[in-house]
């Protein structure tokens, strides 16, 4: 009696179970009474990453430099190429099909996490006692100057965008 289900790494065709092709190979002929499934290796710049019955291999992803992309990991017959972004850029999606410049943190905000090829800059507001007076993709919030340690006094209070202004102590009593 013909099978209705097949083992792992097999598929059902013409009432018989045929072996799937291994990763890196495509199907060129289903098994017959006289022969096993026939598979051929994927060509240059092609891949298949699973046990399969595909008659065509997939093309490796192209990391288009015009979109700011570069190759992070070269594809093999069993894996796709992995793209990442050039310095100063990050991917717009998980599949990394295009890149955009890293966001800068505006004055009053500092860099919590520096951007990578695949993630944007993460900014955070400068808390009390810290400030950032620049728009930057790298600078963290800096602490206000400690006037006391310089034997100075605060002449102008700091904000999240400005440092304190220190001055000499008023010696007049």
């Amino acid at each position: 009696e013909p099978p209705t289900a097949c083992r792992e790494k097999q598929y059902l065709i013409n009432s018989q179970c045929c072996s799937l092709c291994q990763p890196g190979q495509k199907l060129v002929s289903d098994c017959t009474e006289f022969t096993e499934t026939e598979c051929l290796p994927c060509g240059e710049s092609e891949f298949l990453d699973t046990w399969n019955r595909e008659t065509r291999c997939h093309q490796h992803k192209y990391c288009d430099p015009n979109l700011g992309l570069r190759v992070q990991q070269k594809g093999t017959s069993e894996t796709d190429t992995i793209c990442t972004c050039e310095e100063g850029l990050h991917c717009t999606s998980e599949s990394c099909e295009s890149c955009v410049p890293h966001r800068s943190c505006l004055p009053g905000f500092g860099v919590k996490q520096i951007a990578t090829g695949v993630s944007d800059t993460i900014c955070e507001p400068c808390p009390v006692g810290f400030f950032s007076n620049v728009s930057s993709a790298f600078e963290k919030c800096r602490p206000w100057t400690s006037c006391e340690t310089k034997d100075l006094v605060v002449q102008q209070a700091g904000t999240n965008k400005t440092d304190v202004v220190c001055g000499p102590q008023d010696r007049q009593r």
Epitope: T32, F34, E36, L40, R56
Partner: antibody
Framework: QVQLQESGPGLVKPSETLSLTCTVS????????VHWIRQPPGKGLEWIGV???????NYNPSLKSRVTISKDNSKNQVFLKLSSVTAADTAVYYC????????WGQGTLVTVSS | DVVMTQSPLSLPVTLGQPASISCRSS???????????LQWYLQRPGQSPGLLIY???NRFSGVPDRFSGSGSGTDFTLKISRVEAEDVGVYYC?????????FGQGTKLEIK
């Protein structure tokens, strides 16, 4: 029913290219492969190669540098070319449908001689 | 390439007597699927080869039950229980497990 018919010139000069045609009926070239096998007079059988349904090919490594198999699905024909032939290529050439190993063509004798 | 070695190369047999042909492969013919793709063909004088046995022991449709195939791995046998006149010709074993497909050198069966 499945049928295969080999045809081509019976005589080829040394160093020239042998060209044969296999015309098939009873099965579909876009869904089935075709093999070429040869048999020198009084000797055994040798697998030459195959063209698969999608047009991919496998060749016997011993002949790979000289052999080309192609096909024309619309004409139900498969072609064998063997270049730079010598007397050692004198043989009966058979075509065979993949999965139809019970049905061989009648074969065509090709003699390599000047 | 897988080398297929047949013995004997010549086999004179009396009509009605049994006959046996051996075929050895230089490497295992067991595919990773568990199947073994070993065929036997008979080429009668002046004819194309005809399929007798496939996958070691399966008789092709229309083949008389006096023909049987057995074996595993690298050792295979074709047996004819009682030879008849129409069995004369050259017998070939063939493997389609590994590319390139290969054939034995043939065993010529003749009537004594």
């Amino acid at each position: 029913q499945v049928q295969l018919q080999e045809s081509g010139p019976g005589l080829v000069k040394p160093s020239e290219t042998l060209s044969l045609t296999c015309t098939v009926s009873g099965f579909s070239l876009p869904t089935s492969g075709v093999h070429w096998i040869r048999q020198p007079p009084g000797k055994g059988l040798e697998w030459i190669g195959v063209i698969w349904a999608g047009g991919d090919t496998n060749y016997n490594p011993s002949l790979k540098s000289r052999v080309t198999i192609s096909k024309d699905n619309s004409k139900n024909q498969v072609f064998l070319k063997l270049s730079s032939v010598t007397a050692a290529d004198t043989a009966v050439y058979y075509c065979l449908g993949h999965g139809h190993f019970d049905v061989w063509g009648q074969g065509t004798l090709v003699t390599v001689s000047s | 390439d897988v080398v297929m070695t047949q013995s004997p190369l010549s086999l004179p047999v009396t009509l009605g007597q049994p006959a046996s042909i051996s075929c050895r492969s230089s490497q295992s013919l067991v595919h990773s699927s568990g199947n073994t793709y070993l065929q036997w063909y008979l080429q009668r004088p002046g004819q194309s080869p005809g399929l007798l046995i496939y996958k070691v022991s399966n008789r092709f449709s229309g083949v008389p039950d006096r023909f049987s195939g057995s074996g595993s791995g690298t050792d295979f046998t074709l047996k004819i229980s009682r030879v008849e006149a129409e069995d004369v010709g050259v017998y070939y074993c063939s493997q389609t497990t590994h590319v390139p497909w290969t054939f034995g050198q043939g065993t010529k069966l003749e009537i004594k």
